[in-house]
């Protein structure tokens, strides 16, 4: 595996919020990652996170199959060869019904400052 630095992700934003889905946007250096690893975890539950991966050329994805009026923590990592970036997270509350689409609140996003180096 390469020992070079893997660049950090920029920021992650919930662009659209519905009652059963949302759209996630993020920024990242061009060509830096093979794919992005996204985990969608329902807050305050021991249920397994929903995992998905997105090709490294994309900067946006839909996250379907969510529950209405539910808090989620969404975590994204960039992955290339044997490296993964520090996770970047955003918390979101899905809408309670069709009338509330796009009005659910995005709570915050935060990122770590160090890379994970996998041996």
């Amino acid at each position: 595996a390469s020992t070079g630095e893997t660049p950090n992700l920029g920021e992650v934003v919930v662009a659209e919020v519905g009652w059963d889905a949302l759209k996630l946007n993020w920024t990242a250096p061009e060509g830096a990652y093979e794919y992005f690893f996204i985990q969608v975890q329902e807050a305050d539950t021991v249920e397994a996170a929903q995992n998905l991966t997105v090709p490294g050329g994309l900067r946006s994805t839909d996250l379907p199959g969510l529950k209405a009026a539910t808090h989620y923590t969404i975590t994204i990592r960039g992955v290339t060869q044997d490296f993964s970036t520090t996770p970047l997270s955003v918390e979101v509350l899905t809408a309670s019904g069709l009338n509330d689409i796009f009005e659910a609140q995005k709570i915050e996003w935060h990122e770590g400052t160090h890379h994970h180096h996998h041996h």
Epitope: F37, Q50, T53, P64, G65, D82
Partner: antibody, heavy 121, light 107 residues
Framework: QVQLVQSGAEVKKPGSSVKVSCKAS????????ISWVRQAPGQGLEWMGG????????NYAQKFQGRVTITADKSTSTAYMELSSLRSEDTAVYYC??????????????WGQGTTVTVSS | DIQMTQSPSSLSASVGDRVTITCRAS??????LGWYQQKPGKAPKRLIY???SLQSGVPSRFSGGGSGTEFTLTISSLQPEDFATYYC?????????FGQGTKVEIK
């Protein structure tokens, strides 16, 4: 060229466990998902679960939750699938595969040669 | 888990026929939908990825379409070597799921 080589055929008694291995060569192992797919005689394909070695945690189909454990050893580029409490309906060919769409976006899918597991008393 | 309902489960057709197979997802998926062909005793072979992209080396008579919850595989003019079983695979949200399969037989 990626190659996935699986362990040999197994005959097991009902109630026992089986552990099948899948050794990858010819490409990066850690960051690509390995899935396990089974096919009972004359039946369709069933996705059992998968793992991305770099993250370690596996995903399992609901049907197999609690009975299957998928692990990966990055040092030997080998993935494992262990199925417990075997019953006759678990008689099948078990494939490991690198499948497009789950932590892998390459031009081709890669499949192991399959491991036949027979459960019989 | 997302359920993938594939239809029909089997069909009889003649060489030259146009054949369409459908897969319906129990919820919206991210169009990471593949179609596979399997012949007896062999591992499956991918024909289509991302719902409509043709796998390199696969004849252009195969095409994929659809989005959201409904997807199709069409064989525009069935050839002798196309008699096989076809599966859809949703692999964009984990756990992944296969359709039940469609066996294409000679009429």
């Amino acid at each position: 060229q990626v190659q996935l080589v699986q362990s040999g055929a197994e005959v097991k008694k009902p109630g026992s466990s089986v552990k099948v291995s899948c050794k990858a060569s010819g490409g990066t192992f850690s960051s690509y998902a390995i899935s396990w797919v089974r096919q009972a005689p004359g039946q369709g394909l069933e996705w059992m679960g998968g793992i991305i070695p770099i993250f370690g945690t596996a995903n399992y189909a609901q049907k197999f939750q609690g009975r299957v454990t998928i692990t990966a050893d990055k040092s030997t580029s080998t993935a494992y699938m262990e199925l417990s409490s075997l019953r006759s309906e678990d008689t099948a060919v078990y494939y490991c595969a690198r499948l497009y769409g789950y932590a892998y976006y390459g031009a081709f899918d890669y499949w192991g040669q399959g491991t036949t597991v027979t459960v019989s008393s | 888990d997302i359920q993938m309902t594939q239809s029909p489960s089997s069909l009889s057709a003649s060489v030259g026929d146009r054949v369409t197979i459908t897969c319906r997802a129990s919820q919206g998926i991210r169009n990471v939908l593949g179609w596979y062909q399997q012949k007896p005793g062999k591992a499956p072979k991918r024909l289509i990825y991302d719902a409509s992209s043709l796998q390199s080396g696969v004849p252009s008579r195969f095409s994929g379409g659809g989005s959201g919850t409904e997807f199709t595989l069409t064989i525009s003019s069935l050839q002798p070597e196309d008699f096989a079983t076809y599966y859809c695979l949703q692999n964009g949200l984990q756990p992944a799921t296969f359709g039940q399969g469609t066996k294409v037989e000679i009429k």
